[in-house]
Amino acid sequence: PKQTLPKPIIRAESTYMVPKEKQATLCCQGSYGAVEYQLHFEGSLFAVERPKPPERINGVKFHIPDMNSRKAGRYSCIYRVGELWSERSDLLDLVVTEMYDTPTLSVHPGPEVTSGEKVTFYCRLDTATSMFLLLKEGRSRDVQRSYGKVQAEFPMGPVTTAHRGSYRCFGSYNNYAWSFPSEPVKLLVTGDIENTSLAPTDPTFPDSWDTCLLTRETGLQKDLALWDHTAQNHHHHHHHH
């Protein structure tokens, strides 16, 4: 079999959910010394970057201007060192948001509940869509899906303090084209009286891997980066759908 280099890691900078007409940035983290990176979209070559100087940087950024529903879909990247190509990266699903309309999110029995209560979110959108998505802030990869004609329900079951946080919903016109986000609904879950004050609220930082960690090589970095790259490839998965 043909020898190949380890597959690169593809990431969306800041988020994989990009409002229409805004710029998306995808990063492809490959290897120091890579002379060419190719970004592929739905099986087609979409963009090429050639880092300068190649031996000093371990990846590239691809800027996708003016995001729209035609540019939303599955991206992957690949890189070359000398004559040797890498394996293809995992697929990254890029979603366009702020399409058409804005859904309304509500929660039953209400936004303030006690631990153990059953909670259901309702997402309503009157325009033609049948798939609805519920996301928790800071957990944008954990998308819950539900189906309905104009409204979908998201039963959460008995909640715990881990369910605390801000939620938004979207209507989805297809897997990669979503509506505007709803206004957020903040769910407050109070636990047992003695540990309520200690229960931490959920962090609302973006997902830590939604950051482009491209580095310029300095001394020891090359060996560390190679080790880190291999480790990340081993543990990293980017299928959100």
Epitope: Q38, F41, E42, G43, S44, L45, K71
Partner: nanobody, 120 residues
């Protein structure tokens, strides 16, 4: 910089032949699938033919099957389209492109195109 430069178009009589060429630079051509896409005046783009990186797979639009042949020379970074038994309905601007599924000139890499006119 990535460049795709088509040539070989022109005016030809019905039943005649043309060979279109596309010279490619700026990326490693040999691993990239390529398409020929045409656009007739007032019509949307239509993929005429597609070829994968090592030429092991090709496909054609029904309208050109048996008349057109796509090929490539990876050593020379060239893509070709041999067009035989040309018909008036083949009149269009022909583009070579890296796009295989979205035939939109704002997408991926496209050449400037070469005009083919079939007329008696």
């Amino acid at each position: 910089d990535v460049q795709l430069v088509e040539s070989g178009g022109g005016l030809v009589q019905p039943g005649g032949s043309l060979r279109l060429s596309c010279a490619i630079s700026g990326f490693t051509f040999s691993i990239v699938s390529m398409s020929w896409v045409r656009q007739a005046p007032g019509k949307g783009p239509e993929r005429v033919s597609w070829i994968n990186g090592d030429s092991s797979n090709t496909s054609y639009a029904d309208s050109v099957k048996g008349r057109f042949t796509i090929s490539r020379d990876n050593a020379r970074n060239m893509l070709y389209l041999q067009m035989n038994s040309l018909k008036s309905e083949d009149t269009a601007r022909y583009y070579c492109t890296t796009q295989n599924s979205h035939y939109d000139i704002r997408f991926g890499y496209w050449g400037q195109g070469t005009q083919v006119t079939v007329s008696s």
